[in-house]
Each structure stands twice: as structure tokens, then as C-alpha cells.
């Protein structure tokens, strides 16, 4: 008779995800020669121990704090790029701009970039079959927690200017309930970072609207100001031609506006 | 060899501050936790806090905490660790060490802070 | 905090012993638990890290076993350099805590 499982609202841990994530730390650490250190079963093990056995809905940052530990690295303070809800193309333009990083170029970004997984309270068992939904189950799941305390270590390292990516197509450009905006902005420490500037990706080829003057946009220079950083905004009008300039910045067409 | 050489010996009074340096050769000072553990004559080991050197992260036991301050300068490959308001029962051997595996695999030699008026 | 208790707090045994001290977690640490020797007027040595992994140059008659809340080391045949204080230590969350040592003495 098999026995009774706990069903979710979100998908099951990602297949194969042990293997997943230990070749991932080993690809990790061979590119990047400065974390050669890191021994990889190791942070597994770290990884494992976080949410193997534990509740899924009953998830603390402290249960991540070996992982937090083996897995800290050192990023250039000032080159931190942030992003909401446009992720690849941040991660396009940190693969060009290669001395700028978004929390997924870094070790722990990496490990668990587009993975799910959750354990069963009492059982060594991964469960592939349902994990917690964020707003379906509860907040206090193995993912959600994972990604809220990688965020808020990500950020109080940020220093001098940092920069977010932020999706101008969205209806709420600047979401308070988004990683960034429920984390990210309120752990940028003001004593070490003096602007947080913005950059609003435009979605239609003819969009020519200042989407710095959105709303949200506002309410977002509001919460940073507050917080006695400063805050300046950018349209990227065409982020195609914004990509391009990056890789070749010498193009005469570069010089315009993007 | 990994080598992890503190500063000397120090009396200080009741009140006053101490900062206690640590200065690590034989690798990258930069990848690896320095851990802060002091021993008060005759007693066990009680860890202060630590510092990641690349990245300034820190974290201190609650119990020294706003006391304590673990500074780290990376031209020099050198930790430091500055306890204030001394008072005597902060008399101890204090040790600086490299973490490794939420273990600590290199020790300094220690340092004995004595507080006396 | 974490407690971390061993036992005993001292014993006396004699040259080409085997001796056993244990370390008890007052939570599960999983195996993030190091073991230190100290001799007298000296800085602690790692022994073990990660519950059973010799660290570099330590004799193999030194072993760790054990996961979760429950640690072993284990010295299979005591020798003279070996009467020390032995002290285990967790890494799962801060503060990281020390056991209060156990003093092995001669026999």
C-alpha cells in the first residue's frame, strides 16, 4: 500500500535535482577560479540539509545558513545588477557586460536558477511529485525561502551604484511584492549604496512614452529616497539595439538613444 | 603553509577598547571565513563572529554584539577583531581561525587580552 | 542557541587505548560538527571536520562518526602526544557553540 503524500499546488522538485545541482557546482566552480575552493559535496550536503526531513511549509532563513556560508563569494560590491520580472535579459546583458552580475552569475544564483524542490517532514525523501504554491500553500516553502534570503544577502553586498532591470510591459513596472521589491530594496544598505538606478525595458518597437514618470516608478523613487539613496531612471526604448551596443559600444548607431 | 600570526599580548583597563590583529599568508585571504573564538583562563571556547574578507559580509554572536566589530583589510591580508567596553571577564586568550567546512582548520596563535584597573 | 554537550568531561586511560568521547546537539546540526584538540598554552588543532573527515596531517587512529544530534570520536590506539582536551563544535547556525571538552589524562 503506498504511503499517504501531502498533495501541492506546485510542481514537484525538479527531476534528477542532486544531480542537477552538483554538476552544476562543479561546472561553477571550473569556470570561475577563484571558487576552486569550494568542495561541492559540500554544498550539496548544505543544500540537502536545508529542506531534507523539514515540513515544506515550515522553512526558515536559519536552515540555510550552512549553504549561505559555504556558498559566499566575492562580486565587485558595485557591479550588482537587480531585475524584476525580466530576467533573461538581464542575464543576456550580464553575459556581455561580463564585469556586472545578477544574483544567477553568482554560485548560489546558479545552483538553483529555474529549480524546484521540497522534502517531506520525517523522510529522507525529495518530493517529485508536489511542492508548495507560494500563494496556494504558503510563503515559508524551500524555494521561496532560498530566493528571499539568497536576495537579501545579494543586496546588502551591493555598493555605490546599483542597478535594476525592471519590465516596462508589466502593468505594475515596479512591483512591491516582488523579490526586488519586497527584499531587495529594503536591504541596500545607505551607508554603502549612494544610487539605485533604474532601468525600464521597453516591450513595443513604437513605445515612446517616459515610463520613468509610471506610477510605480514613483512610488519606487519614494521608498528609496526614504531610505536617503538616490535614485535616477533610464528608458531603454529598443533593448535589442540596447544588447547590441553593449557587445559593439564603438557603433555610430550607438551613440543615440536606445 | 597556511598561516594565521596575531598581535601580542595586551592589558587594558575596564572601560577602554582592544583591537587584535590576525594577519593570514599561504592562500587567498579573500576566499575564506576568518572566525574569531576566545578562552577565558581555565575555560572552554566561546566563537565571537566572523567575517568573509572579499565581501565584508560579518555575523557575531548575539552576546557581543554592538561590542565586538570584525574588520578585515584586504591589501594587507589582515583581520582584526575590536572588543570595547572591557570589562574583566572579557580577560581571555583570543583567537583568530580559518573557516572551512563551518569548521576551523588553521588557528593563530592566540592573543591574551588582560583587563585589569 | 545550540547546546553541545560531551561526556565525559574527563577520563584517564592508558597507552594504546582505544577511547570513545561523545558530543550530543540539543537540535540536529546534520554532520556539521568539528572536533578540536588543545594541549595547554596552545591554540586548538581541527582534527575532524564535517563529522568524519580527517583533516590534512592528522594520524588515521583519529575518526569522527555520527549525524544529526549524535557524534563519536574515536582514537583507536591512544599514544603519548594524544593526552590532551578534545573539544567538538557545530557549524548548522550561529552562534556556533563549543562542547565544554573533555580532558583525557593518563592512567
Known amino acids: 500500500v503506498p504511503r499517504w503524500r501531502q498533495q501541492w499546488s506546485g510542481p514537484g522538485t525538479t527531476k534528477r535535482f542532486p544531480e542537477t545541482v552538483l554538476a552544476r557546482c562543479v561546472k561553477y566552480t571550473e569556470i570561475h577560479p577563484e571558487m576552486r575552493h569550494v568542495d561541492c559535496q559540500s554544498v550539496w550536503d548544505a543544500f540537502k540539509g536545508a529542506f531534507i526531513s523539514k515540513h515544506p511549509c515550515n522553512i526558515t532563513e536559519e536552515d540555510y545558513q550552512p549553504l549561505m556560508k559555504l556558498g559566499t563569494q566575492t562580486v565587485p560590491c558595485n557591479k550588482i545588477l537587480l531585475w524584476s520580472r525580466i530576467k533573461d535579459l538581464a542575464h543576456q546583458f550580464t553575459q556581455v557586460q561580463r564585469d556586472m552580475f545578477t544574483l544567477e552569475d553568482t554560485l548560489l544564483g546558479y545552483l538553483a536558477d529555474d529549480l524546484t524542490w521540497c522534502g517531506e517532514f520525517n523522510t529522507s525523501k525529495i518530493n517529485y511529485q508536489s511542492c508548495p504554491d507560494w500563494r496556494k500553500d504558503c510563503s515559508n516553502n524551500p524555494v521561496s525561502v532560498f530566493w528571499k534570503t539568497v536576495s537579501r544577502r545579494f543586496a546588502e553586498a551591493a555598493c555605490d551604484v546599483v542597478h535594476v532591470m525592471l519590465n516596462g510591459s508589466r502593468s505594475k513596472i515596479f512591483d512591491k511584492n516582488s523579490t526586488f521589491g519586497s527584499v531587495e530594496v529594503h536591504n541596500l544598505q545607505p551607508e554603502k549604496v549612494q544610487t539605485l538606478e533604474a532601468w525600464v525595458i521597453h516591450g513595443g518597437r513604437e513605445d515612446s512614452r517616459d515610463l520613468c514618470q509610471d506610477p510605480t516608478i514613483k512610488e519606487l523613487e519614494s521608498i528609496i529616497s526614504k531610505r536617503n539613496i538616490q535614485f535616477s531612471c533610464k528608458n531603454i526604448y529598443r533593448p535589442d539595439k540596447f544588447l547590441q551596443c553593449v557587445k559593439n559600444p564603438e557603433d555610430s548607431s550607438c551613440t543615440s538613444e536606445i | 603553509q597556511v598561516q594565521l600570526v596575531q598581535s601580542g599580548a595586551e592589558v587594558k583597563k575596564p572601560g577602554s577598547s582592544v583591537k587584535v590583529s590576525c594577519k593570514a599568508s599561504g592562500y587567498t585571504f579573500t576566499n575564506h571565513w576568518i572566525e574569531w573564538v576566545r578562552q577565558a583562563p581555565g575555560q572552554g571556547l566561546e566563537w565571537i563572529g566572523d567575517i568573509f574578507p572579499g565581501g565584508g559580509y560579518t555575523d557575531y554572536n548575539e552576546k557581543f554584539k554592538g561590542r565586538a566589530t570584525i574588520t578585515a583589510d584586504e591589501s594587507t591580508s589582515t583581520a582584526y577583531m575590536e572588543l570595547s567596553s572591557l570589562r574583566s571577564e572579557d580577560t581571555a586568550v583570543y583567537y583568530c581561525a580559518r573557516g572551512r567546512d563551518l569548521a576551523m582548520d588553521y588557528w593563530g596563535q592566540g592573543t591574551l587580552v588582560t583587563v585589569s584597573s | 542557541d545550540i547546546q553541545m554537550t560531551q561526556s565525559p568531561s574527563s577520563l584517564s586511560a592508558s597507552v594504546g587505548d582505544r577511547v570513545t568521547i561523545t558530543c550530543h546537539a540539543s537540535q540536529n546540526i546534520n554532520v556539521w560538527l568539528g572536533w578540536y584538540q588543545q594541549k595547554p598554552g596552545k591554540a586548538p588543532k581541527l582534527l575532524i571536520y564535517?563529522?568524519?573527515n580527517l583533516h590534512t596531517g592528522v594520524p588515521s587512529r583519529f575518526s569522527g562518526s555520527g549525524s544529526g544530534t549524535d557524534f563519536t570520536l574515536t582514537i583507536s590506539s591512544l599514544q603519548p602526544e594524544d593526552f590532551a582536551t578534545y573539544y567538538c563544535?557545530?557549524?548548522?547556525?550561529?552562534?556556533?557553540?563549543f562542547g565544554q571538552g573533555t580532558k583525557v589524562e593518563i592512567k
Open positions: 564535517k563529522a568524519s
Open positions: 563544535q557545530q557549524g548548522q547556525s550561529y552562534p556556533y557553540t
